[in-house]
């Protein structure tokens, strides 16, 4: 019932599940300099009945020994084939965490967790895509992918999404040099936009690094 592959990777896009189907596993990963406690769980598991779902197990990280401070926790070999990384939600995430039947919501952060969350999705899981800030979707409407079982094999449907980063350089009033517009880089967000997350901050790097917008550590 676990999906064999990752959801499709779309250049300059990120994906997220609205909720996680029962059976989904989340690796207990720790940030650099920390490791799982010796008796700690390898993963959290979304379990439940028809009326309520919740995450079993708790992830706990402890400080690594001095000689191991640069060592990151990695999944066990049997875990590695279904690594799906998704963003960590901001503790200030302005989304209600009410439950959906048969699904678990995003687990709350645990102390010293890694900057990326690695999920192991199950058949029937849907993920939604969004172009990263500074890129535009060429198609209208939502973009989503579902893990399906076909002839005994799992596959993810291909989302209808192309994110373009065509540049529009223009002289911004009061600036000495031109800046790229949001097709490539947000131009005026520092003065005209207030945001609740690192969405815009991350894309300051995106124009040159093409980094994911959702891999920042909790502040």
């Amino acid at each position: 019932e676990l999906c064999d592959d990752d959801p499709p990777e779309i250049p300059h896009a990120t994906f997220k599940a609205m909720a996680y189907k029962e059976g989904t596993m989340l690796n207990c990963e720790c940030k650099r300099g920390f490791r799982r406690i010796k008796s700690g769980s390898l993963y959290m598991l979304c379990t439940g009945n028809s009326s309520h779902s919740s995450w079993d197990n708790q992830c706990q990280c402890t400080s690594s020994a001095t000689r191991n401070t640069t060592k990151q926790v990695t999944p066990q070999p049997e875990e590695q084939k279904e690594r799906k990384t998704t963003e960590m939600q901001s503790p200030m995430q302005p989304v209600d965490q009410a439950s959906l039947p048969g699904h678990c919501r995003e687990p709350p952060p645990w102390e010293n967790e890694a900057t990326e969350r690695i999920y192991h999705f199950v058949v029937g899981q849907m993920v939604y895509y969004q172009c990263v800030q500074g890129y535009r979707a060429l198609h209208r409407g939502p973009a989503e992918s579902v893990c399906k079982m076909t002839h005994g094999k799992t596959r993810w449907t291909q989302p209808q999404l192309i994110c373009t980063g065509e540049m529009e350089t223009s002289q911004f009033p009061g600036e000495e040099k031109p800046q790229a517009s949001p097709e490539g880089r947000p131009e005026s967000e520092t003065s005209c936009l207030v945001t609740t997350t690192d969405f815009q901050i991350q894309t300051e790097m995106a124009a040159t690094m093409e980094t994911s917008i959702f891999t920042t550590e909790y502040q």
Partner: antibody
Framework: QVQLVQSGAEVKKPGSSVKVSCKAS????????ITWVRQAPGQGLEWMGG????????SYAQKFQGRVTITADESTSTAYMELSSLRSEDTAVYYC???????????????WGQGTMVTVSS | DIQMTQSPSTLSASVGDRVTITCRAS??????LAWYQQKPGKAPKLLIY???SLESGVPSRFSGSGSGTEFTLTISSLQPDDFATYYC?????????FGGGTKVEIK
């Protein structure tokens, strides 16, 4: 076809707050932005900010910084706009609208709510 | 902020007329411009996105053109249902801004 249904008209005192809801029926938010736009009587349209419900990213126009909070409840497909420290010039029709593509909150708006009239008067 | 200037602010026309509304941006916005129609007491309705793409379900008599700083909305043959106010919107740079509107009224 998704429809956006907004809460009813409100009459508020200066200095108070108002919270307007916007429920999507006939579909979920998925990853499309929900934006709030207001229109004072006889005036044009003014963008306040927006949110991508699933991703939780809210963007606000600086004009409303510190006064507006946009949130979303994915489980009920409802977005909310709360405006505080109301003054008479906040009297307007407040619209929610859905983004036309998954391009963050910097988008055009293909589906609109019916509008909520907020009157601020002492 | 990017200023969007629409002209004319009011336009008197008759059924069957070809109508053109202009929208100018204070700086280049590439093609990230939308046009909306609004009738009294109603929410705006998207007509055109990305400067020239016709929204699904919108009659083909509506068309949009332009890029950079100058854009036009054209109604090839004005119909009774088209008397309304039209707004342009730029979504190239935050904050999103709208033009002041063009009211198309019966001559």
């Amino acid at each position: 076809q998704v429809q956006l249904v907004q809460s009813g008209a409100e009459v508020k005192k200066p200095g108070s707050s108002v919270k307007v809801s916007c429920k999507a029926s006939g579909g979920t938010f998925s990853s499309l932005a929900i934006t709030w736009v207001r229109q004072a009587p006889g005036q044009g349209l003014e963008w306040m900010g927006g949110i991508i419900p699933i991703f939780g990213d809210a963007s606000y126009a600086q004009k409303f910084q510190g006064r507006v909070t946009i949130t979303a409840d994915e489980s009920t497909s409802t977005a909310y706009m709360e405006l505080s420290s109301l003054r008479s010039e906040d009297t307007a029709v407040y619209y929610c609208a859905r983004g036309g593509s998954v391009s963050g909150t910097l988008v055009d708006f293909d589906i609109w709510g019916q509008g909520t009239m907020v009157t601020v008067s002492s | 902020d990017i200023q969007m200037t629409q002209s004319p602010s009011t336009l008197s026309a008759s059924v069957g007329d070809r109508v053109t509304i202009t929208c100018r941006a204070s700086q280049s916005i590439s093609s990230w411009l939308a046009w909306y129609q609004q009738k009294p007491g109603k929410a705006p309705k998207l007509l055109i996105y990305k400067a020239s793409s016709l929204e699904s379900g919108v009659p083909s008599r509506f068309s949009g053109s332009g890029s950079g700083t100058e854009f036009t909305l054209t109604i090839s043959s004005l119909q009774p249902d088209d008397f309304a106010t039209y707004y342009c919107q730029q979504y190239n740079i935050y904050p999103i801004t709208f033009g002041g509107g063009t009211k198309v009224e019966i001559k």
